[in-house]
């Protein structure tokens, strides 16, 4: 959130939504911290740890199985986009504790703050894909007997990592460092050069694309799964789907503030009482969102706890069990009427 | 080494609109640092005025922000104070300075007296 | 603003003396403070910055110091080319404001 805005006496850091302000400058005075950034430093942290950790043993485990089971895949690319900004985390965390001071340079500021955005769509659109491949498993279980492969899979995810990232470009293309005098401090956030229009384009682009379009769509989408999953009272396992569905809710969930925020702050004077409060609250939001990046893991575990009754298991076997369950999609591409109708029974639940 | 030299009229009349000059030499006002004004009244208090940044942000001092302006000639590696329109409270001893951290290097300081 | 209540406005020492003027912040400045001289033909000369920082080509016997908001210059031995007005700055924020200036004269 991060924009400078020629009017604002205090700054944002680093994501995107707020807007450096060149012509009124920062008012940091005091050597404490305030609580809202002390709170995200405490979430950076956590994030950080559970995070690398997290995701790169799901990393490891869904790797080896990626060739042969689709949902290895799946889960794989959302883990890899929330490892790379998982990197980022030291970076800002370092800069919050210096005051939003970034001394890093041009380049990193351009591309570290972006990674959570970049993270941002790529997950919506890897949870998109992975909703769409739960629905046909769904409504058209022939189909997928048919040509539910990995290498359709492997296809998907690139044009997903492909289309997060040019929607990432506005975020990069408009972050800029700037040094302040009084403090003697450099900032880096993004400039909008005065275009209120621009800012509040790019806000709701990312509302939109982000946020609501997603809500929306993945709404009606696990709407029609679980009711045709309850109305066939499927005795198979719905592992995966509930999974899917906690990941999905999670990125509302630690989305919302991030994007309430950043569309209220371009709306906005940025001498109003509102977006200064929302401006001290920019680093929160952030740390909030990033929460997205170490919660699959740990959703992961408790799955696999709640699927085990109990932690028996070794944690990769957990995680394993968990992520890498194919769905029920015969191998053999001849196949009887009767067999279509049992595995249209079958996937039901998935 | 970095220097600085303010020039201006010296004595001007109230409303009318005049521009202080400030010339630095060894050391490019685009490289970085911001580049201030600050007046010394007759009793000897200070105040900042603004700002010219290397890269031409411009910040000023909320009191005087609707009365003066602030710009610069790269070509020339100067940067101007003007006032749309003096009054006798404007009779100080005006000062550039370079600010990095802080002011580091100031000039000699220029008289502007506002009088009838 | 950030007020700075500079004390005392005026002092009379002697060759060698030791001296010490101060600087009161109306709020925190977290350290951000200059000490100016200026001389009687009116150039000004940044002692100090950072609260403690000695600027380069300033003699040893100028030192900084902070207890909480108020910050402090010490002479510890003038010499005859000390006797000068004397202005602390704060610049940790917008607007950066001086404070009112110490005279400080031979005895």
């Known amino acids: 959130m991060d924009s400078f805005n020629y009017t604002t006496p205090d700054y944002g850091h680093y994501d995107d939504k707020d807007t450096l302000d060149l012509n009124t400058p920062v008012d940091k005075t005091s050597n404490t911290l305030r609580v809202p950034d002390i709170l995200a430093l405490v979430i950076f942290a956590v994030v950080f740890l559970v995070g690398v950790l997290g995701n790169a043993l799901v990393v490891w485990v869904t790797a080896f199985e990626a060739k042969r089971t689709i949902n290895a895949i799946w889960f794989l690319n959302l883990a890899v986009a929330d490892f790379l900004s998982c990197l980022a985390l030291p970076i800002l965390f370092t800069s919050i504790v210096q005051h939003h001071h970034w001394p890093f340079g041009g380049a990193a500021c351009s591309i570290l703050p972006s990674l959570i955005l970049l993270n941002m769509y790529a997950s919506i659109l890897l949870l998109a894909t992975i909703s769409a491949d739960r629905f046909l498993l769904v409504f058209k279980p022939i189909w997928c007997q048919n040509f539910r492969g990995a290498g359709l899979a492997w296809i998907a995810c690139a044009v997903a990592w492909g289309l997060a990232l040019l929607l990432t470009i506005p975020s990069f293309l408009y972050r800029v460092v700037r040094e302040e005098y009084f403090p003697p401090k450099v900032l880096c956030g993004v400039d909008y050069s005065h275009d209120k229009r621009r800012e509040r384009a790019v806000a709701i682009v990312r509302l939109v694309l982000g946020f609501l379009w997603p809500l929306l769509t993945l709404t009606i989408c696990y709407t029609f799964i679980l009711l045709r999953t309850w109305s066939r009272r499927a005795t198979r396992s719905t592992k995966t789907l509930k999974v899917v569905v906690a990941v999905v809710a999670s990125f509302f969930i630690f989305w919302l503030p991030y994007q309430v925020t950043g569309i209220m702050m371009s709306f906005l004077e940025p001498s109003s009482p509102t977006f200064l409060l929302l401006k001290k609250l920019d680093s929160l939001c952030v740390s909030f969102a990033y929460i997205n990046c170490c919660i699959n893991p740990i959703i992961y575990v408790v799955a696999g706890q709640g699927f085990q009754g109990r932690l028996r298991k070794s944690l990769p076997s957990l995680l394993r069990n968990v992520l890498t369950e194919e769905s029920v999609v015969r191998e053999s591409k001849s196949f009887t009427r009767s067999t279509v109708d049992t595995m249209a029974q079958k996937t039901q639940a998935v | 080494d970095v220097q600085l030299q303010e020039s201006g009229p010296g004595l001007v009349k109230p409303s009318q609109s005049l521009s202080l000059t400030c010339t630095v030499t060894?050391?490019?006002?685009?490289?970085?640092?911001?580049w201030n004004w600050i007046r010394q009244f007759p009793g000897n208090k200070l105040e900042w005025m603004g700002y010219?940044?290397?890269?031409?942000?411009?910040s000023y001092n909320p009191s005087l922000k609707s009365r003066i302006s602030i710009t610069r000639d790269t070509s020339k590696n100067q940067f101007f104070l003007q006032f749309n329109s003096v009054t006798t409270e404007d009779t100080a001893k005006y000062y550039c300075a370079r600010a990095s951290i802080g002011f580091d290097y100031w000039g000699q300081g220029t008289t502007l007296t506002v009088s009838s | 603003d950030i007020q700075m209540t500079q004390s005392p406005s005026s002092l009379s020492a002697s060759l060698g003396e030791k001296v010490s003027l101060t600087c009161r912040a109306s709020q925190e400045i977290s350290g951000y403070l200059s000490w100016l001289q200026q001389k009687p033909d009116g150039s000004i000369k940044r002692l100090i910055y950072?609260?403690?920082t000695l600027d380069s080509g300033v003699p040893k016997r100028f030192s900084g110091s902070r207890s909480g908001s108020v910050y402090s210059l010490t002479i510890s031995s003038l010499e005859s080319e000390d006797f000068a007005d004397y202005y602390c700055l704060h610049y940790a924020n917008y607007p950066p404001t001086f404070g009112g200036g110490t005279k400080l004269e031979i005895r």
């Open positions: 060894g050391y490019s006002i685009t490289s970085d640092s911001a």
């Open positions: 010219i940044s290397y890269s031409g942000r411009i």
């Open positions: 950072a609260a403690s």
